[in-house]
Interface confidence: low
């Protein structure tokens, strides 16, 4: 359960991979596509609104957070659209939705011991947003080796 419906804080940041590729969003045929690409230096990075929520219960058994509390985030690159986990297709998609947001839009935020974070599906513990063949996908990770998978590490920059 998420403590309170309102986020405890929000921030606007651009999202890039461990290898410094940018996560970009493009409107195509009335739907948003998500790309992982090398940006030319002069091109502006897309920003994502991260809304942080506090949850009282760990989403998976792997390495409990401090006092069992965790931060959950939702990611919105543009008004009314949120990143969502599609566990059946192992995909990450952008969907237009109204609040209250569905569980698929919530991700447990893992602060990693680099300048990186990871996003674990609230609905599927042990499954993370990751990079696969130059697009975002859901990747199952053995969480106990929590620095191991570079493809699930992301950098947030203002």
């Amino acid at each position: 359960s998420i403590t309170g419906i309102s986020p405890i804080t929000e921030s606007l940041a651009s999202l890039s991979t461990y290898n410094d590729q940018s996560i970009t969003f493009a409107l195509e045929d009335e739907s948003y596509e998500i790309y992982v690409e090398d940006l030319k230096k002069d091109k502006k990075k897309d920003k994502v609104l991260l809304s942080y929520y506090e949850s009282q219960h760990p989403s998976s058994e792997s390495g409990d957070g401090v006092d069992g509390k965790m931060l959950m985030v939702t990611l919105s690159p543009t008004k009314d659209f949120w990143l969502q986990a599609n566990n059946k297709e192992h995909s990450v998609e952008l969907h237009k939705c109204e609040k209250p947001l569905p569980d698929q839009a919530f991700f447990v935020l893992h602060n990693r011991s680099f300048n990186c974070v990871s996003f674990e599906c609230k609905t599927d513990p042990g499954v993370f947003i990751g990079v696969k063949d130059n697009h975002l996908a859901l990747i199952k990770v053995d969480y106990s080796e929590n620095l191991g998978s570079e493809n699930i590490l992301f950098k947030l920059s203002e």
Epitope: T9, P58, E61, G65, H110, N115, G148
Partner: antibody, heavy 119, light 110 residues
């Protein structure tokens, strides 16, 4: 009760060796990154080394690289620090600490064990 | 010398508000979460604040943390005699691939 208990400290001569142990209880040890942190008498905290849950990822402070070796035995719920070529400046209280993996914060600390390097 | 810079000492009278600063760089505080620890004389450090501004369960709300750019701070309001201790900040440093602590601040309650 979640607990970390260090042992193995003592007096050792410069150039000597010592092996510290940290026994964990009350939590699933095999799921956590573990760290050693030390504190010289009257000084601040200094991070020494860390090891991932399955020993795949190991990091050391420059000051101990090549002399100290961190290891763990998940079947025994125990963390180790093998200290070789000890110097006077290694004299300190050595703490083992658990990294709360979702937080990058040391949420559980042992009580510490004193290592004195002196002739 | 510590990578993160803290004032060596701070003081205040009971009831006062005291702030302890922790200054770093873009490779540590600028990019990573900061945590704060309290160490009472003769005891192991104790976690107070994690993820830069999240108070650990059981820690009085008199303690609060914040982060801006490459600096972080710990604020203690309604100072009490039992707050007299050493306080340390902590972060991961990307360039060093190491944990870095501040040098510690000795808080005296006058």
């Amino acid at each position: 009760e979640v607990q970390l208990l260090e042992s193995g400290g003592g007096l050792v001569q410069p150039g000597g060796s010592l092996r510290l142990s940290c026994a964990a209880s009350g939590f699933t040890f095999s799921r956590y990154y573990m760290h050693w942190v030390r504190q010289a008498p009257g000084k601040g905290l200094e991070w020494v080394s860390s090891i991932s849950a399955r020993s795949s990822y190991i990091y050391y402070a420059d000051s101990v690289k090549g002399r100290f070796t961190i290891s763990r035995d998940n079947s025994k719920n125990t963390l180790y620090l093998q200290m070789n070529s000890l110097r006077a400046e290694d004299t300190a209280v050595y703490y083992c600490a658990r990294l709360a993996t979702r937080r990058d914060a040391f949420d559980i600390w042992g009580q510490g064990t004193l290592v004195t390097v002196s002739s | 010398q510590s990578v993160l810079t803290q004032p060596p000492s701070a003081s205040g009278t009971p009831g006062q508000r005291v702030t302890i600063s922790c200054s770093g760089s873009s490779s540590n505080i600028g990019r990573n979460a900061v945590s704060w620890y309290q160490q009472l004389p003769g005891t192991a450090p104790k976690l107070l604040i994690y993820a830069s501004n999240m108070r650990r369960l059981g820690v009085p709300d008199r303690f609060s943390g914040s982060k801006s750019g490459t600096s972080a701070s710990l604020a203690i309001s309604g100072l009490r005699s039992e707050d007299e201790a050493d306080y340390y900040c902590w972060a991961w440093d990307d360039s060093q691939k190491a944990v870095v602590f501040g040098g510690g601040t000795k808080l005296t309650v006058l």
